[in-house]
Amino acid sequence: AVDLTLLANLRLTDPQRFFLTCVSGEAGAGRGSDAWGPPLLLEKDDRIVRTPPGPPLRLARNGSHQVTLRGFSKPSDLVGVFSCVGGAGARRTRVIYVHNSPGAHLLPDKVTHTVNKGDTAVLSARVHKEKQTDVIWKSNGSYFYTLDWHEAQDGRFLLQLPNVQPPSSGIYSATYLEASPLGSAFFRLIVRGCGAGRWGPGCTKECPGCLHGGVCHDHDGECVCPPGFTGTRCEQACREGRFGQSCQEQCPGISGCRGLTFCLPDPYGCSCGSGWRGSQCQEACAPGHFGADCRLQCQCQNGGTCDRFSGCVCPSGWHGVHCEKSDRIPQILNMASELEFNLETMPRINCAAAGNPFPVRGSIELRKPDGTVLLSTKAIVEPEKTTAEFEVPRLVLADSGFWECRVSTSGGQDSRRFKVNVKVPPVPLAAPRLLTKQSRQLVVSPLVSFSGDGPISTVRLHYRPQDSTMDWSTIVVDPSENVTLMNLRPKTGYSVRVQLSRPGEGGEGAWGPPTLMTTDCPEPLLQPWLEGWHVEGTDRLRVSWSLPLVPGPLVGDGFLLRLWDGTRGQERRENVSSPQARTALLTGLTPGTHYQLDVQLYHCTLLGPASPPAHVLLPPSGPPAPRHLHAQALSDSEIQLTWKHPEALPGPISKYVVEVQVAGGAGDPLWIDVDRPEETSTIIRGLNASTRYLFRMRASIQGLGDWSNTVEESTLGNGLQAEGPVQESRAAEEGLDQ
């Protein structure tokens, strides 16, 4: 909470002496526009309780962390609500003081009421000057409830608020009907956002147990300590006359904190200072009472005396809140009930004790389950305790069990038993499992069954190339996740082992058994390009491709040609097993089919990027044979062929192919293209004289069709030896295609 206190001086005989002071213990508070943030604000809040206008109040800043409001000219100036705002940013906090007129018709029995969410709040207005009229109750200035004047109980009007919620917080007032509002009893109700002993969002967190009347803040769980107390749980009393979160402030004047009301950040509210009570905080606590508003009871034992500021002051030899604890009997302090260590570790165990006479190193000992007594090797002596440190020999499983710390002095002895659990570090029973591999990485499942004790805190994977003497590489991984070993060498065997650890010093177990994991070949990175393809028949396709030129050896074993027949949903794969190959003949394809063709480099089992695909249409089965082929010799070196076009053509003829062979000859036939498909005759020239020839022909529509009948004809006699046959159509000579 913000260290902000609003003090009201309640010496009311003279209003002009009345003052309000706001004090901040925050670093750099109140410096205004400089780097330390906004200033302290102290003002009268007229939103709910309005008083007649008077001369303006005087605001005086005293140093960087104090501001005082003076200049009250008449008692009515004092009545109402005052607020102080301090702290920067999200810590900006408002502290509220509610002032009642001492001469009012009704006076509050208690001004500030701090209650928990869901509690019943009871506001009690005591009759000071009786009027026989109804009493109006208001909440934050708005009408709330009416009580008949007969309903006063024991001279008090009570307002019961059951099951209060935070929005019920605010300023409440009780006023006689038709009386001046200045004669009202004013109350402040603070409703914590949580039930008793809880704080935080959803009120799930437990308060620390604030002492001496401290109130647990429902947002941050800190104790807002009453004036005069300090510490995280308000366990410590300040010296008389001091206040603030660290007892750093001093009450003004010779009479200390007498006559001052202290208001602190919500949910504390306002009270007298420690040792004082009454409506004007001018009464000292009755014997046996202490603290703010004298709300706490001493109940001192063993000759302790009650100090109204700090509680029990114990005689020599006693301590405790009520002096109930003897200094003479030694006492083991804050010993854990259970400790856990790992096997074969040599832990240090601390044992702290207090007493009178003060325990020394030799008076504290540690006893193992087997009865062995250990003496401390070192002791740390502090004003309130001695801490002995024991160096335990290497732990074995038999050390599990109940150990005992014992302290002995002339004042007596004390002992505390605690359980020691010796745990066995985990050792993998199996090797890690390979999930996937690539050329430069292995994906491994590291979590395996193990002997020893969990939980597994870390998993280490150790790996290095097989048969290597180099240091192991180590990677620490999450036990529940697969791990990727990266930056490995392609086509290399790695020895991989797991090491498991459990929490605590010495929790690392032995390495598990090794396993061999081998990285894959390097991926073939080059993308081929299809450079060409041509149909060599209705079911044959010749494909050529290229590869980009890169420095270094080619990473690849060969090529994979893929032909996708989308109509039938079939893929054909052709393996070309030489990485030097750049062409392939694909046979046995389906005539008339539309194929999508691509090529990939492969290496081992890995495929490289595919070439952009090509779309290839194989011709349907070839056209029927040309009809009525006839041969007629024209000279000793020329024969004319005539024919009729085939019937029922599936498409336009692209060319005719004529086959020429010497009758009875052993050589290969010659093929001659007739590239003008509209022709029905052609002259074959360059033949030998007096030679018998065989002719046949076929048409081509993308693919070659069926052969015609074979015809025979002889050239005329006695010519010279020709160079070889050529074909001449009516228009032009054409080349020979063998």
Epitope: E531, L549, S611
Partner: antibody, heavy 118, light 107 residues
Framework: EVQLLESGGGLVQPGGSLRLSCAAS????????MLWVRQAPGKGLEWVSV????????FYADSVKGRFTISRDNSKNTLYLQMNSLRAEDTAVYYC???????????WGQGTTVTVSS | DIQMTQSPATLSLSPGERATLSCRAS??????LAWYQQKPGQAPRLLIY???NRATGIPARFSGSGSGTDFTLTISSLEPEDFAVYYC?????????FGGGTKVEIK
């Protein structure tokens, strides 16, 4: 310095044509596959077309097939994209890019804007 | 066609923080995946190729990992100049396809 510089973009009516050019410098052009990628306003990258180093093979995205033609002139170190029958959805910044042997699209031009609007 | 899906669409981070961008392919693309960076009004720039190799001149704070269908681009400590859109792209099969992009913006 390895550089690609596109040109030929502009405003054209639906159904119209444009020819984009991409001039390459700072590297030997002929051994590399080249491609066009486009980016519609406020959208991601879309591959359009690719051509092999020799120019013998071309391939197109379905969205432009039959309307766009990619070509190259290795003697002039230039890549082309002939765009016909343009539609409003062809509005984009067109980038030419080099297809590295092992790296993918390793060099990009600065882009040229094509707007198809009536 | 292979679909590439990037997540998240937007990543709001402060300079110095670590950025982790994901890319998932609808089928295996082996390690043939590239990452590109694009700043407003500029052409894309190749950062990572073949899943984990840094392109020439790319700082060591950029790293790529993954194979098959799941890939990650990590920027170990964001510099002011790293706030941009990042695309992944597969080159395993044609058509080469890009992810929808992840915008890394200043928180």
């Amino acid at each position: 310095e390895v550089q690609l510089l596109e040109s030929g973009g502009g405003l054209v009516q639906p159904g119209g044509s444009l020819r984009l050019s991409c001039a390459a410098s700072g590297f030997t052009f002929s051994p590399y596959g080249m491609l066009w990628v486009r980016q519609a306003p406020g959208k991601g990258l879309e591959w359009v077309s690719v051509i092999s180093p020799s120019g013998g093979q071309t391939f197109y995205a379905d969205s432009v097939k039959g309307r766009f033609t990619i070509s190259r002139d290795n003697s002039k170190n230039t890549l082309y994209l002939q765009m016909n029958s343009l539609r409003a959805e062809d509005t984009a910044v067109y980038y030419c890019a080099r297809l590295g042997a092992e790296k993918g699209m390793d060099v990009w031009g600065q882009g040229t804007t094509v707007t198809v609007s009536s | 066609d292979i679909q590439m899906t990037q997540s998240p669409a937007t990543l709001s981070l402060s300079p110095g923080e670590r950025a982790t961008l994901s890319c998932r392919a609808s089928q295996s693309v082996s390690s043939y995946l590239a990452w590109y960076q694009q700043k407003p009004g500029q052409a894309p720039r190749l950062l990572i190729y073949d899943a984990s190799n840094r392109a020439t001149g790319i700082p060591a704070r950029f790293s790529g990992s993954g194979s098959g269908t799941d890939f990650t681009l990590t920027i170990s400590s964001l510099e002011p100049e790293d706030f941009a859109v990042y695309y992944c792209q597969q080159r395993s099969n044609w058509p080469h396809t890009f992810g929808g992009g992840t915008k890394v913006e200043i928180k």
